[in-house]
Amino acid sequence: FAATFYDIETLKVIDEEWQRTQCSPRETCVEVASELGKSTNTFFKPPCVNVFRCGGCCNEESLICMNTSTSYISKQLFEISVPLTSVPELVPVKVANHTGCKCLPTAPRHPYSIIRR
Amino acid sequence: FAATFYDIETLKVIDEEWQRTQCSPRETCVEVASELGKSTNTFFKPPCVNVFRCGGCCNEESLICMNTSTSYISKQLFEISVPLTSVPELVPVKVANHTGCKCLPTAPRHPYSIIRR
């Protein structure tokens, strides 16, 4: 706004910054065990994986950046059960990966299937 | 681990994933007003900026990825006071940018100067 008062280049820089902060899928580090709700005697190596999760800003304070579509990606991890009775097993672990995001009210009344962060 | 039992390529992929999840400065979207602790009648356009903040996993569950060094970067933003008595002003806003991170205990008893996230 108020474009007439300001240098076009400055406004362009500000606008680019704003675009980059918008609600979108962003690469995030998640802890596998807490993600899967595993008991403390099951753990993974590595304990964390990189996936995309919705994050960023919305135009209104009353809105929250939430996922509207999700895919599940498979990560090869060592699953270790304690007490250790066998060699740690290499297992494919499916982790939610957000593919679409939208700024939504905190208690959405529309039929999106949301997995909250 | 257990390198002898598994295909080297698979282990390499797992190790690379682990390296990418490690505690390090990551580009993050922060809300300027809450970052600066501004009153509700002052807001910024855009409301969010991109800076680097410490994030990721540590080798121990009891450690937290925290910043050990910080720079302050200046972002050009419109500062708007409500009720609007004048034209929105273009101001330089200094925001903390984490430049170094370390996995640290939550209540460090050693003399690190930590700015908690």
Epitope: T40, F43, K45, P46, P47 | F1, A2, A3, L11, D15, W18, Q19, Q22, C58, N59, E60, E61, S62, K102, C103, P105, T106, A107, P108, R109, H110
Partner: antibody, heavy 118, light 112 residues
Framework: QVQLVQSGAEVKQPGASVKVSCKAS????????MYWVRQAPGQGLGWMGY????????TYNQKFKGRVTMTTDTSTSTAYMELRSLRSDDTAVYYC???????????WGRGTLVTVAS | DIVMTQTPLSSPVTLGQPASISCRSS???????????LHWLQQRPGQPPRLLIY???NRFSGVPDRFSGSGAGTDFTLKISRVEAEDMGVYYC?????????FGQGTKLEIK
Amino acid sequence: QVQLVQSGAEVKQPGASVKVSCKASGYTFTGYNMYWVRQAPGQGLGWMGYIDPYNGDTTYNQKFKGRVTMTTDTSTSTAYMELRSLRSDDTAVYYCARTSYYGGMDYWGRGTLVTVAS
Amino acid sequence: DIVMTQTPLSSPVTLGQPASISCRSSQSLVHSNGNTYLHWLQQRPGQPPRLLIYKVSNRFSGVPDRFSGSGAGTDFTLKISRVEAEDMGVYYCSQSTHVPRTFGQGTKLEIK
């Protein structure tokens, strides 16, 4: 299987330095913190500090601050602990111990006896 | 530093009978993430310590089920349901919630 092989016993004079090595095998070296613990003859266990082999970050017990340095060589999966300005009360068995993600020291080296005597 | 106090310091036991070791910390060992990082180690004569129990009650790999851990906050217990000859040695509690990591002074388990 996980193994931590430590260097041999050392006899040092007061004021000297000692560097103990701990070669790890059977796991991804950079994925676990390495702790160093010492035990004086007939005494209990004392924690010296740890190193994160991924990036070389260290956290030391204040008791040893300025006298201890922990390092790693990721190419050989070896951790090192150097203790300087040795005194007679530094005579102890020095252990390296791998720490699991959940905080327990799950695998230990067999220990290196360091004797400080003039 | 967190002080870990073990009782008793020496415990003469009869083979086949139960044994119990107590460990009390000078501050709560509950981490800000809700977990409690209290562990138990066993050290047999001439051997390095060996992890028995991690995070209060989780038995480590290869540890017999006669060993169990319990407790919360500042008070913790290691129990051996039926003591065997191979259980003789010194038992240590340790905490990794706070820095510096600290150990109890040890409890010597010996045959009566």
